[in-house]
Amino acid sequence: QTSVSPSKVILPRGGSVLVTCSTSCDQPKLLGIETPLPKKELLLPGNNRKVYELSNVQEDSQPMCYSNCPDGQSTAKTFLTVYWTPERVELAPLPSWQPVGKNLTLRCQVEGGAPRANLTVVLLRGEKELKREPAVGEPAEVTTTVLVRRDHHGANFSCRTELDLRPQGLELFENTSAPYQLQTFVLPATPPQLVSPRVLEVDTQGTVVCSLDGLFPVSEAQVHLALGDQRLNPTVTYGNDSFSAKASVSVTAEDEGTQRLTCAVILGNQSQETLQTVTIYSFPAPNVILTKPEVSEGTEVTVKCEAHPRAKVTLNGVPAQPLGPRAQLLLKATPEDNGRSFSCSATLEVAGQLIHKNQTRELRVLYGPRLDERDCPGNWTWPENSQQTPMCQAWGNPLPELKCLKDGTFPLPIGESVTVTRDLEGTYLCRARSTQGEVTRKVTVNVLSPRYE
């Protein structure tokens, strides 16, 4: 009778095992093992027992011990079961971002692993089991469908294999796939709201605001604001499920014309976009041209107003004739015109909006000097010892210099409070002088002596 020990072995792939072949007869003619595996005989004294080291066991095998005794030949098999954990446990790739409400199919593929009867595939969300199935086929494939919810955001999905060899006195061998982290999102069907100026003047700054509600997770939303090819750099403010992106936009002469303002919101693998046109225009203030900004009284003055070729101007409230970008008026300069403002208002239509620009210039009229009775009386009579203020105002532009002298030397203190004395009496020659010329006027001061009773 041939016997084998152990009769059943479970061993790791590539492992070795010692198999003892024994026979019940004392002097067997033959005792050995039949196996395709590499083997070594581990010698022992005696004839009725042989120990073999079988090595590099890659797959299940049934080595057979045999013996030839006087009473006949017999055999005994040992069953070698190889175990090994799967070489590949993988979740089929999925886009990391998934919209809420979508059905997501998780597919786990398992390559290798044995014995298959002890191999189970488990699909998990975090530590929660979603599906558990025995590994069948090569590669084994297990799938499950998940309805994507908001609270799945950031959840880790994985696939685990369990090679349970505890019934065989070994352990539970687990292999886990790389996790798939689900990013859920909600991007509303409504496009973002874009608030911006419809028209923007060259070399100025405008403010653009792009906003959208009903986003999840709002902090992951990417906002792209651009005017033509110019990428804007917005400051984004987040609410619970909304954002507002505010950016300053500066335009130059190169941007003139109709430009496309874009606000794109990207969340997950989806985007929403709003387009708006902005007209960039150049409209310098109109030019007010005076023949000369400073003229002498009586000079003919031409006032011209020139604006953007497509503008319409009014000069001092009078529209150009014909209506257009130029207007002018002629006048003879009078002292009353000194300091007079000439205002030109230009109006330009840009993308249906009327834009107004103004420019003002002031005319200076040189005149005088003047000394007249109203402002410089020719006769003063004052009681002696009274307090008086001699007044004489010379007019002209530029303002004349005024001096009043008696006998060419004694000055009359104009604009100063004085005590009237006999010395003050007399005739004074008041002289007003400016770059425009000189005028004189005689002023007589009479002093009344007190009457003694």
Epitope: L18, K40, E41, L42, L43, L44, P45, E53
Partner: antibody, heavy 116, light 107 residues
Framework: EVQLVESGGGLVQPGGSLRLSCAAS????????IHWVRQAPGKGLEWVAR????????IYADSVKGRFTISSDDSKNTAYLQMNSLRAEDTAVYYC?????????WGQGTLVTVSS | DIQMTQSPSSLSASVGDRVTITCRAS??????LHWYQQKPGKAPKLLIY???QSISGVPSRFSGSGSGTDFTLTISSLQPEDFATYYC?????????FGQGTKVEIK
Amino acid sequence: EVQLVESGGGLVQPGGSLRLSCAASGFNIKDTYIHWVRQAPGKGLEWVARIDPANDNTIYADSVKGRFTISSDDSKNTAYLQMNSLRAEDTAVYYCTTSGYWFAYWGQGTLVTVSS
Amino acid sequence: DIQMTQSPSSLSASVGDRVTITCRASQSISNNLHWYQQKPGKAPKLLIYHASQSISGVPSRFSGSGSGTDFTLTISSLQPEDFATYYCQQSNSWPYTFGQGTKVEIK
């Protein structure tokens, strides 16, 4: 009948070399493993080296690694232990033995004395 | 390396006595332990392999037991030819190592 016979021992100066032989009979060395085990005078047993004659796979004790080389010749059914850079502490009876994990058959031993 | 410690180092016993020798491994070696008997001037002789497996031609009074780290060789009734030195050896991992030996002497 399984038999192992060692030869090649003797007196050698420190730093010298010796080559021990182990002639096997009654079995084919390719079908098992051959080991060398030594025993210093009055001391215990120390495993030295092992060879798998089927593929010349070898393993050594740290104390002899780099100095001793175990080899085999299938045609002669003989294993060898080449000992170089010998030291006084290598003085021992060297046994050739067979089997894989245990040592079922031993030779009679050959004495190696390292002394100046 | 796995250290093997035998106890006692020596013992005196009389013919017919039951003798027990223990061997302790510095770490678990499963059942990869073997026992040898050596008489002066002779090569060692295998008595037990794999902790408890008997050898053809070895008297049945020799038996072995144990697993993991603690092992025992028992001679149920000591005979005159059993006075010798006994060694344990582990084959769990390289390098294979022996115990320091236990000398059994006549009392």
